[in-house]
Amino acid sequence: LTCLGGFASPGPVPPSTALRELIEELVNITQNQKAPLCNGSMVWSINLTAGMYCAALESLINVSGCSAIEKTQRMLSGFCPHKVSAGQFSSLHVRDTKIEVAQFVKDLLLHLKKLFREGQFN
């Protein structure tokens, strides 16, 4: 029983697992999309430098009342070391460049798949 104790208390999720789960969630969103995602809401595009997860969260957190991306918002917050609230504008956003949430999610998914393949889990 002592040996099995570790299984009972969930420890920190390995970065590779967290990234895989985020990818799976984004796959779910893109595959199950029937009506325009979040009523076709627009979000800021982002740069893909360090802090990309925070920038993605800062963009998506400004979309309210869209249950389809709530889980994604929560998952992204796990990758972002600081508190993110609506209205924040990061230098990692591309100013004057807004894209549809559906495209943002789709492109974020493509980028994360590439990171996963390259073993970049953080």
Epitope: S45, L48, I99, D107, H111
Partner: nanobody, 118 residues
Framework: GVQLLESGGGLVQPGGSLRLSCAAS????????MGWARQAPGKGLEWVSS????????YYADSVKGRFTISRDNSKNTLYLQMNSLRAEDTAVYYC???????????WGQGTLVTVSS
């Protein structure tokens, strides 16, 4: 929606140079591997060159190697093709396109005509 808008085409003499640009909008440009393809009059589509998302890995068709240079500026959402030592056989409509293997990530511009003639 997604838009790829090519510019820079035109008439040029053999041996001359042109620089094509492709302005991207409606998607996260820096995520995508990108490329240029061309279609000569009465011929099929030929993939000319591609560049990875970060801009540090490039590919060129043998027919343009050493003459064409592909580059990108992710901060400007723009793809470029510098074409030097142009030949009559480079005459074609040049298309900017995404170059991803993943299904559903295939986007193409409308094309810009390059005519090499004296």
């Amino acid at each position: 929606g997604v838009q790829l808008l090519e510019s820079g085409g035109g008439l040029v003499q053999p041996g001359g140079s042109l620089r094509l640009s492709c302005a991207a909008s409606g998607f996260i440009f820096a995520v995508y591997d990108m490329g240029w393809a061309r279609q000569a009059p009465g011929k099929g589509l030929e993939w000319v060159s591609s560049i990875n998302d970060g801009g540090n890995v490039t590919y060129y068709a043998d027919s343009v190697k050493g003459r064409f240079t592909i580059s990108r500026d992710n901060s400007k959402n723009t793809l470029y093709l510098q074409m030097n030592s142009l030949r009559a056989e480079d005459t074609a409509v040049y298309y900017c396109a995404t170059a991803e293997d993943e299904p559903g990530y295939d986007y193409w511009g409308q094309g810009t005509l390059v005519t090499v003639s004296s």
